[in-house]
């Protein structure tokens, strides 16, 4: 595989707070050229977060993902651990990027042409039949909002790198984690996750390309480890909300302040990011702006157009 330039594609200025490893499907290390070392974590909703490799929970999570990947391989699933540049991987799933990430159009990097195949069903949900990324969250106020950026994954909002947009050229990532069901953003990862159940179709919904955003944590939204249990309240359903920004600081923990730079490869199509639920916390809709990046497959220029998210709904009524 040809891994384009080795310049730093993702720089992390803010590290995420703890995320349950159960919500993670992959990790990768950023390049040495980035200076500040960081681990890029991908959640089952295909959201990316910067994590501090020195933190114990991050070490434990990587170890856990390594074990899962090894088990997966033993069980016949193929898992490609790729060590290469950290570029947005291509895949039909919508991903989200956190404020800690800034997209940098990269003219040189040629990424591998691997088309990630939807691996087990889990990843699929990110692109599943539903237009929005799975899951809304509940907030301390008791309302579940529509899925906003990080929640479902459980990643702190504020530190999410970005949602991986569909890219015509796949980027290589070093990942060490078994794929959870769903189209995987990691190139060519296949697994047999759940034997005794039907295989959901994997339709990818278009996703917008990652775009950095700096949103302050919404009020009342829970931070990881904090917040109230989501409870429904009269209010919107957590369904049908407009695309939610891929970078929200739902968790106060993951407040703005982290900016990661990600070089982008041409995206084959433009799409809106599906939203993911915010972590359970007060589910107050945030004013987030999904960013749509249109990339001409022939060019590496990126057009980022903020699209205000007009709708937001809470899950439980």
């Amino acid at each position: 595989q040809h891994h384009g330039v080795t310049k730093c594609n993702i720089t992390c200025s803010k590290m995420t707070s703890k995320i349950p490893v159960a919500l993670l499907i992959h990790y990768q290390q950023n390049q040495a050229s980035c200076g500040k070392r960081a681990i890029i974590l991908e959640t089952r909703q295909h959201r990316l977060f910067c994590a501090d490799p020195k933190e114990q929970w991050v070490k434990d999570a990587m170890q856990h993902l390594d074990r899962q990947a090894a088990a997966l391989t033993r069980n016949g699933g193929t898992f490609e651990k790729q060590i290469g540049e950290v570029k947005p991987r291509t895949t039909p799933a919508a991903g989200g990027m956190d404020e800690s990430v800034v997209l940098e159009p990269e003219a040189t990097g040629e990424s591998s042409s691997l088309e990630p195949t939807p691996s087990s069903q889990e990843a699929q949900r990110a692109l599943g039949t539903s237009p929005e990324l799975p899951t809304g969250v509940t907030g301390s106020s008791g309302t579940r909002l529509p899925p906003t950026p990080k929640a479902q994954d459980g990643g702190p909002v504020g530190t999410e790198l970005f949602r991986v947009p569909p890219v015509s050229t796949a980027a290589t990532w070093q990942s060490s984690a078994p794929h959870q069901p769903g189209p995987s953003l990691w190139a060519e990862a296949k697994t047999s996750e759940a034997p005794s159940t039907q295989d959901p179709s994997t339709q990818a919904s278009t996703a917008s390309s990652p775009a950095p955003e700096e949103n302050a944590p919404s009020e009342g939204q829970r931070v990881w480890g904090q917040g109230q249990s989501p409870r429904p309240e009269n209010s919107l359903e957590r369904e049908e909300m407009g695309p939610v920004p891929a970078h929200t600081d739902a968790f106060q923990d993951w407040g703005p302040g982290s900016m990661a730079h990600v070089s982008v490869v041409p995206v084959s199509s433009e799409g809106t990011p599906s939203r993911e639920p915010v972590a359970s916390g007060s589910w107050t809709p945030k004013a987030e702006e999904p960013i749509h990046a249109t990339m001409d497959p022939q060019r590496l220029g990126v057009l980022i157009t903020p699209v205000p998210d007009a709708q937001a709904a809470t899950r439980r009524q």
């Epitope: 579940r144 899925p147 459980g154 069901p181 996750e193 159940t197 709904a313």
Partner: antibody, heavy 119, light 107 residues
Framework: QVQLVQSGAEVKKPGASVKVSCKAS????????IHWVKQAPGQGLEWIGW????????KFNERFKGRTTLTADKSTNTAYMLLSSLRSDDTAVYFC????????????WGQGTTVTVSS | DIQMTQSPSSLSASVGDRVTITCRAS??????LAWYQQKPGKAPKLLIY???TLADGVPSRFSGSGSGTQYTLTISSLQPEDFATYFC?????????FGGGTKVEIK
């Protein structure tokens, strides 16, 4: 109001199958994972697995793989758990539950369905 | 898999007593712990998540603490409606696992 309403009690013979349903209301069904939990008589709780209704993706506790099938019908906002080749130790109350997206703890539960396996 | 060991398995207390229930994990669960209350014939009810965050509508007499592998649920002043069985659950990694339960009975 978020609600999970499960089907009624079932009595089955060993070797048979049983399908328990869990109808969700009050929220967008396809946005939240539905989990299934087993509680044998006088025992603790055991996580069986989850299904993501948005695309039907399941994940299982290894202990329940093979004889358990999790499905979801988006048109009726209903999740199902099929237990096949029933044995006496499958006798238990089965709960469906759902939670927020920042972690898989369960803030809403169905009322439980008692499955009795007896010859 | 992470095993959750809860103690004591049962205890007798009186209204007004301070009650403490412990849950020990076989591995570090990084504070991703929830506590539930269950009454006979009913579904469990979420009390606390993320080790110490109170779920909506849960009285402040309930509190959670701990880190690493050791966690505690405390009921500062037991009320008549608190007599029930309590379970802990780790949601750090799958398979999610629960403690064996602690039955709080009236002395």
């Amino acid at each position: 109001q978020v609600q999970l309403v499960q089907s009624g009690a079932e009595v089955k013979k060993p070797g048979a199958s049983v399908k328990v349903s869990c109808k969700a209301s009050g929220y967008t069904f396809t946005n939240y994972y539905i989990h299934w939990v087993k509680q044998a008589p006088g025992q603790g709780l055991e996580w069986i697995g989850w299904i993501y209704p948005g695309d039907g993706s399941p994940k299982f506790n290894e202990r329940f793989k093979g004889r358990t099938t999790l499905t979801a019908d988006k048109s009726t906002n209903t999740a199902y758990m099929l237990l096949s080749s029933l044995r006496s130790d499958d006798t238990a109350v089965y709960f469906c539950a759902t939670g927020p997206t920042d972690g898989d703890y369960f803030d809403y539960w169905g009322q439980g369905t008692t499955v009795t396996v007896s010859s | 898999d992470i095993q959750m060991t809860q103690s004591p398995s049962s205890l007798s207390a009186s209204v007004g007593d301070r009650v403490t229930i412990t849950c020990r994990a076989s591995g570090n669960i990084h504070n991703f712990l929830a506590w539930y209350q269950q009454k006979p014939g009913k579904a469990p009810k979420l009390l606390i998540y993320n080790e110490k965050t109170l779920a909506d509508g849960v009285p402040s007499r309930f509190s959670g603490s701990g880190s690493g592998t050791q966690y505690t649920l405390t009921i500062s002043s037991l009320q008549p409606e608190d007599f029930a069985t309590y379970f802990c659950q780790q949601f750090w990694s799958t398979p999610y696992t629960f403690g064996g339960g602690t039955k709080v009975e009236i002395k």
